[in-house]
Structure formats: structure tokens, C-alpha cells
Amino acid sequence: EVEKTACPSGKKAREIDESLIFYKKWELEACVDAALLATQMDRVNAIPFTYEQLDVLKHKLDELYPQGYPESVIQHLGYLFLKMSPEDIRKWNVTSLETLKALLEVNKGHEMSPQVATLIDRFVKGRGQLDKDTLDTLTAFYPGYLCSLSPEELSSVPPSSIWAVRPQDLDTCDPRQLDVLYPKARLAFQNMNGSEYFVKIQSFLGGAPTEDLKALSQQNVSMDLATFMKLRTDAVLPLTVAEVQKLLGPHVEGLKAEERHRPVRDWILRQRQDDLDTLGLGLQGGIPNGYLVLDLSMQEALS
């Protein structure tokens, strides 16, 4: 807390400029009018104030706007944003995407801070849903943003926003998140032709059900092993050897290297060994010839 002292003669700030960098903390407190500061916030970002000077300027704004800063000030906070606490940000009402972009720019290159997380939360809640422009902006600054949301939060993402998602944005998503995103992606890309559709839907396939994988196997998509390994195990298990061969195309040879890993391992255990042998890859662990396979889950469903 800076002591209240009178401003020395001739030091009253008439505008926010470089001369203020030589002001001591108490001089800034005494000689800079908070209303002047609020109207010239865009200049603060350009002037190399020290941390301690920024603290004083923040204190002045806090006194002027105890209920939270107006958006006209927030948009021009610049580096002063880094001084804000999540509690400060919760008082804000940020509605402009330009304001959001301006503040994210300040934090660019750094991990998502609690301040940024609070800002995004306030912004998205204010909008009611995660629209395409917002998602575009957030994933541009934080590629992992989408995967930081809960399945419940993801459910508010409209299918139209899926066009903004890049493959790397989904790198850290878990199956529960992909379960929510996949149907939205399927809807978003439904009017695309086969090969184009596959390119777009590929990153989301970790949420695809068996019937969609079967359908893809009829389209000569040549899925790579990395994508196959991310598929839901329960979706892969019902696929036949022929369907997996069609799904992977020339990449089918990669199964050998992955035979000890899920979902390949579990899939092998469900296939007849003589069917696996038709691949010519030396995959072992299938059901020996002559054994009867009982699908207990089907039996339970019938009873």
C-alpha cells in the first residue's frame, strides 16, 4: 500500500508518457490521476514501467473501479493484465473477442496461467457457447485448450466450431472428450466427399463407434497405424480381419509391430487364427481353429 502524499510542485502528470518511468512509487500515486490513466491505458503498455510501478498503476485503477474495470480499460491493459489476480478478473464482463485477443497476446508463449483460465471462463460463459471465432482464437493461442475442457463443457461446442480445430489441438484429448467431439465432427463434415472427409475426421476417430469404422473400411481410406492405435478398443474389437485390412490398406503391415499393444492385442485375441494368418504378418494369439466363440454379451442381451 502506497502512502498518500501530496504531489511535488510541477510533477503532476498531464499525460501518460516516458517521463513517468523516473517517478518513484509514491510520486506515481500522488501525481497520476486515475481517470487520466484509464483514458490513456493504451500508452501504459508501450512504456517500460518496472514491476513496482505497474503495481502502483493497478492500485490506482482498483480504486477508480472497485466493482471491476470497464471493457474500454480492459482492452488496453496490456502487460498490466499480468498483474491481475483471478479474483480481479471475476469482476469483469468481457464480451469483445478483440479484448480477449489483446489479453491473450500479452501471455503469448507462456503456459495458460490462472488469470488466463479465468478470463476465458468469464468470456465463454458470457457468450453462452464456444462459437467458432472464439474457438479459433483460443486454439491459436493454446493448442491444447480444447482438451482442457470437461466433456460437459465440450457439449456446448456447436458443430460449426469444429472447422476451427486442427489435429494438434486434439493431441492431449482423452477418449471421453473425443466421444463428445466425434459426433459433432461427423455432423460438421457430413457433406464432404470420401477422401476429404477422412482427412478432416481422422483426428476425431478416437471417439468413433464400430459401425462408423466399418463404413470407413469400405472407402479405401488407408488409415495410418498412429490413428488406428488411438481408436476405442471397444469399437475395434468387433471388426473382422477383412475389415481391418481394408481400413488400414498398405498400413496393415504395421500391425505386427503393435501386436502387444492395445487395441491391436485385444483385437487379435478376438480373431480366428486362420483369419489372422491370411494377412501373412505372423500375428499370433488368435482363437485356435476348431474352437467355438461364444459372445456372452449377445447371449445376455437375448435372455
Partner: antibody
Framework: QVQLVQSGAEVKKPGASVKVSCKAS????????MHWVRQAPGQGLEWMGI????????SYAQKFQGRVTMTRDTSTSTVYMELSSLRSEDTAVYYC?????????????WGQGTLVTVSS | DIQLTQSPSSLSASIGDRVTITCRAS??????LAWYQQKPGKPPNLLIY???SLESGVPSRFSGSGSGRDFTLTISSLQPEDFATYYC?????????FGGGTKVDIK
């Protein structure tokens, strides 16, 4: 990559002026303040002042007020530091240095230095 | 102006030694302190900022600590390329000031 390239060494007589240039590349010139720091032979570092390459506004350390002028040319991404009324104690290596922003006024990139020798 | 006093002004050490340099400010600067390394004929090179944050590309044997008035630069295991002069700099208030330097040479 970020580079600050300074003009060559100068020998000046007492009372004369010297103008040192610093050409920036590898980043947005107008987005970072440029500072000038000098170092007398065998001595420590001394901060002289700053220039805002965007607007051209300046702030100088009190010791150099009235003798130093910092300017910039945005078309060539170059800043200049002119020191007048030179005396022998101004003999030093002069550095331009780019500072971080947002309270972090430390120097992440420096020019290679320009030796200014003041001798009669 | 804030004065920074470095100690020692020079020290002799051997390869592999743990070296500690201190910087004391005439008034508190919070964590607004940086450390630089300078070799003859070269400009200073940033090692540490905000008292303890390692600049990217700087070997992890360098570390900084302290807050307020007293700060320390530590080299955990001195390497041949570490023989140089080290400076601290405060950026708590203007004018920005530097310590007088600590020269580290071979024992």
C-alpha cells in the same frame, strides 16, 4: 534470429560529438524499447537512457541530460545515440540493448559494442 | 538511485568448483534483478532474470536466488567456459543500475 549490429569504432577530440548507430533485425523493431549502456575500459556497466522506436520518445539518465540525443529511423530499423561535448571520461564501449517489456526491464539482446575513444 | 554492491570483486576457482557470487541492493528491489556474464571484448549475456528464472539456452549449472536486498548467483560446477566477469542489474526502479562486477578466473 534477433540481431543488433552497431557502427564501427570512433576516435574523437574533446568537445566534439559522436553518433553511434544500432541496426535491429529479426523482430518487430517498433515493439521493443532500445536502451543504451556504456562501459568504460576495465569498468562496470552504466545505463544511459531509452528510446521508443515506435513514437521516437526518449528518457535519459540524469547524468547525460543535455548531452545525449537518441533518435531512430523506422525505415531502416536503426536507432542512433549521439553524445556531445565529449570529454576523456566518455571513452568507453557503447552498447545498444533490447529490453523486455511488462515490468521486465532487463536486456535479452545486445549489440556487439562500439568503442569511442576521446583523445586530444 | 539504487546502488548494487557485488562481492567478491574477484575470485579464483578451479574447474568443478561450486562458485557463489552475491549482490546486495541499497534498498529492496523485490525480485527485479538480473544476472549477466561478460567475456573480454564481448557484450554481456543474460543468464538469470526475475532473480531466479533461467534464461533459455543457459546451462542449468547456473542458478539465482534471493529477494528484497540480497541476491546470489551460483555456478554449481565451474566449467572452462565460465571464466568471465559477472554483473547483477536491478530493474525495480529507474535509473537502471548494475553491480560493479565479479571477475572469476582460474586458480
Amino acid at each position: 534470429q534477433v540481431q543488433l549490429v552497431q557502427s564501427g569504432a570512433e576516435v574523437k577530440k574533446p568537445g566534439a560529438s559522436v553518433k553511434v548507430s544500432c541496426k535491429a533485425s529479426g523482430y518487430t523493431f517498433t515493439s521493443y524499447y532500445m536502451h543504451w549502456v556504456r562501459q568504460a575500459p576495465g569498468q562496470g556497466l552504466e545505463w544511459m537512457g531509452i528510446i521508443n522506436p515506435s513514437g521516437g520518445s526518449t528518457s535519459y539518465a540524469q547524468k547525460f541530460q543535455g548531452r545525449v540525443t537518441m533518435t531512430r529511423d523506422t525505415s531502416t530499423s536503426t536507432v542512433y545515440m549521439e553524445l556531445s561535448s565529449l570529454r576523456s571520461e566518455d571513452t568507453a564501449v557503447y552498447y545498444c540493448a533490447r529490453a523486455q517489456r511488462g515490468g521486465s526491464v532487463y536486456f535479452d539482446y545486445w549489440g556487439q559494442g562500439t568503442l569511442v575513444t576521446v583523445s586530444s | 538511485d539504487i546502488q548494487l554492491t557485488q562481492s567478491p570483486s574477484s575470485l579464483s576457482a578451479s574447474i568443478g568448483d561450486r562458485v557463489t557470487i552475491t549482490c546486495r541492493a541499497s534498498q529492496g528491489v523485490n525480485s527485479a534483478l538480473a544476472w549477466y556474464q561478460q567475456k573480454p571484448g564481448k557484450p554481456p549475456n543474460l543468464l538469470i532474470y526475475d532473480a531466479s528464472s533461467l534464461e533459455s539456452g543457459v546451462p542449468s549449472r547456473f542458478s539465482g536466488s534471493g529477494s528484497g536486498r540480497d541476491f546470489t548467483l551460483t555456478i554449481s560446477s565451474l566449467q572452462p567456459e565460465d571464466f568471465a566477469t559477472y554483473y547483477c542489474q536491478q530493474f525495480s526502479s529507474y535509473p537502471l543500475t548494475f553491480g560493479g562486477g565479479t571477475k572469476v578466473d582460474i586458480k
